[in-house]
Amino acid sequence: LVPHLGDREKRDSVCPQGKYIHPQNNSICCTKCHKGTYLYNDCPGPGQDTDCRECESGSFTASENHLRHCLSCSKCRKEMGQVEISSCTVDRDTVCGCRKNQYRHYWSENLFQCFNCSLCLNGTVHLSCQEKQNTVCTCHAGFFLRENECVSCSNCKKSLECTKLCLPQIENVKGTEDSGTT
């Protein structure tokens, strides 16, 4: 089966790599523009230069292209705790990240928020904090994990999942009380 191709892909596949088919004349293959530039005018004929212009400040193209406009540079989202790792250049978009001792949580493919890495108080670090994943904590006896923090079993209500983890602790407390009454 032949994979389905979009119109642009169909047109480009007629020409050798690094060239694209002239939109008004399908017998002409024009050279694509280098990254950092965009298509100002198609080549007038075979073997003639494509008119490519450099992207203006605040825009970029990261690969060879025949785009009529450069892409707008991304802005780091301060409200999401993001910081700029590297600024936008004509051939590379802005790179955003998080501060030290923070990790990225992706709410969607193109939206992340920075959160502080868990310190595992009342527990131990099972896996260290990574760029896109919080610390994984293992809680000490008498504590259970809630929202990645080790919380005392005294805060465990019967309706919560923690009852399984805290059950031995609860039984110990009952046992101590029982032995004290004899």
Epitope: R77, K78, E79, H105, Q113, F115, E147
Partner: nanobody, 119 residues
């Protein structure tokens, strides 16, 4: 006590419009980034849009870009979501929430308002 109360949902035909509102109380509304999330039947929460405290540079999910507009009125402690050119896939319960601070969960979220897009 933080309270978020959504309204404005209902049944609408494809291509139609709705305006959701979220009345906020119990915190300083003007200091918080506010979020709209939605949950379609049998699916997880999807981030729809958010707006910072002064209402600049709102974010939209690709699925709603160009059709939905988020806004806020800090004098009325109210968040809005104007939804145009509605599609069947926009059918969901829509929740307004405060931007999470401690971790990737919603400490403060409303009860939601149901939007059904159907002919």
């Amino acid at each position: 006590e933080v309270q978020l109360l959504e309204s404005g949902g209902g049944l609408v035909q494809p291509g139609g419009s709705l305006r959701l509102s979220c009345a906020a109380s119990g915190f300083t509304f003007a200091h918080e980034t506010m979020v709209w999330v939605r949950q379609a039947p049998g699916k997880g929460l999807e981030w729809v849009s958010h707006i910072d405290r002064v209402g600049q540079d709102p974010y939209y999910a690709d699925s709603v870009e160009g059709r939905f507009t988020i806004s806020r009125d800090n004098s009325k402690n109210t968040l809005y979501l104007q939804m145009n050119s509605l599609r069947a896939e926009d059918t969901a319960v829509y929740y307004c929430a405060l931007l999470p601070k401690r971790g990737p969960w919603f400490d403060y979220r409303g009860q939601g308002t149901l939007v059904t897009v159907s002919s």
